[in-house]
């Protein structure tokens, strides 16, 4: 699998998204992970509901939202004022018993907020109140990683 | 306007089969954007979710864990309804069946799901 | 399963009396939660869907309102058609359970 890299603004939201064969997939869950370490395990953040014909419904776990397009074969994960910490690697799963595959790798990566929000008390922020439908969403910027590029950065 | 008519006897023997019939009017039992129910209520149990059929380009059904083992709910294309079978049943098992139609809601988007439209219920006893 | 708990079992009040019945869930549920009117041997009537939103139809009087494991239904103004029974409902688990009823009478 290769990597594909989601940009998001700091404050913001971010919508990734993970396409995959509606057939091949079908009748399964989906989850969103963050992996931990290169060799680590996948850490479950999220998965859509646990019956199947309501996977549509958006799922959420604190500021993470995922949905599932089963006829169209589109998972949908939106971060949800994304900080600092949000960044790193995640995976995109399809569960069947007690194993799971993997839809879509990714990076996110959180980019600094131009205008920094954190010195402009008098601009809206989404409150915890607000739903992930109220929240704007950013068109994420995309890329997969290019051959040669090393998803995990060895450690000194 | 969407109805559901319920059919089937109202008396089964302990250890058979419950054979129930939803037809459907002014929807389809194909329709990617609903699913099919039976809930069941007794004074005893309340009202209780049984399972659901649906068609996302193939059929698939889910059941509640406590029927889970006895229960099958089918499609009839051809004349756009759909049925429940509950075997072995016991005495527990006597209560008022309804059909329902379960469906998204619009607004919020992605957020409700609900039973909308409910079949006039039959009431089935159990007993030899 | 989820399990949820309305209070209270039943209640007596008077046309146009502000009606509160409350439906409580073993767990965190979101806003996954519905509302249905029930008149004895009639099938039950979706009045809220997703905690909060009225159902086309249903009359503005009814109202929905929480979120996570404490909700409540609102009648502002009872009418004599609203002498029923109410239940609530969660989609939240894979088996759909329903709390097990309000009894709203005549005083």
């Known amino acids: 699998h290769n990597t594909t890299v989601f940009q998001g603004v700091e404050g913001q939201s971010l919508q990734v998204s993970c396409p995959y064969d509606s057939m091949k997939h079908w009748g399964r869950r989906k989850a969103w992970c963050r992996q931990l370490g290169e060799k680590g395990p996948c850490q479950r953040v999220v998965s859509t509901h646990n019956l199947w014909l309501l996977s549509f419904l958006r799922r959420r776990n604190g500021s993470t939202a995922i949905t599932d397009d089963t006829l169209g074969g589109t998972l949908t994960i939106t971060l949800r004022n994304l900080q600092p910490h949000d960044a790193g690697f995640y995976q995109c799963q399809s569960l069947h018993g007690s194993e799971a595959d993997t839809l879509r790798k990714v990076l996110v990566e959180v980019l600094a907020d131009p205008l920094d929000h954190r010195d402009a008390g008098d601009l809206w922020v989404p409150g915890e109140s607000e739903s992930f439908e109220d929240a704007h969403v950013e068109h994420s910027i995309s890329r997969s990683l290019l051959e040669g590029e090393i998803p995990f950065p060895p450690t000194s | 306007q969407v109805q559901l008519q319920q059919s089937g006897p109202g008396l089964v023997k302990p250890s058979q089969t419950l054979s129930l019939t939803c037809a459907i009017s002014?929807?389809?039992?194909?329709?990617?954007?609903?699913?099919w129910n039976w809930i069941r209520q007794s004074p005893s149990r309340g009202l209780e979710w049984l399972g659901h059929?649906?068609?996302?380009?193939?059929?698939?059904?889910e059941y509640a864990v406590s029927v889970k083992s006895r229960i099958t709910i089918n499609p009839d294309t051809s004349k756009n309804q759909f049925s429940l079978q509950l075997n072995s049943v016991t005495p527990e098992d006597t209560a008022v069946y309804y059909c329902?139609?379960?469906?998204?809601?619009?607004?919020?988007?992605?957020?409700?799901?609900?039973?909308?439209?409910w079949g006039q219920g039959t009431l089935v006893t159990v007993s030899s | 399963d989820i399990q949820m708990t309305q209070s209270p079992s039943s209640l007596s009040a008077s046309v146009g009396d502000r009606v509160t019945i409350t439906c409580r869930a073993s767990?965190?549920?979101?806003?996954?939660l519905n509302w249905y009117q029930q008149k004895p041997g009639k099938a039950p009537k979706l009045l809220i869907y997703?905690?909060?939103n009225l159902q086309s139809g249903v009359p503005s009087r009814f109202s929905g309102s929480g979120s996570g494991t404490d909700f409540t239904l609102t009648i502002s103004s009872l009418q004599p058609e609203d002498f029923a029974t109410y239940y609530c409902?969660?989609?939240?688990?894979?088996?759909?359970?329903f709390g097990q009823g309000t009894k709203v009478e005549i005083k």
């Open positions: 002014g929807d389809s039992v194909s329709s990617s954007s609903a699913a």
């Open positions: 409902q969660q989609y939240t688990d894979e088996s759909m359970t």
């Open positions: 997703a905690a909060s």
């Open positions: 059929i649906g068609y996302r380009s193939k059929w698939y059904n």
């Open positions: 767990q965190g549920i979101s806003s996954d």
């Open positions: 329902a139609r379960g469906m998204y809601g619009s607004v919020p988007y992605k957020e409700g799901y609900y039973f909308d439209i």
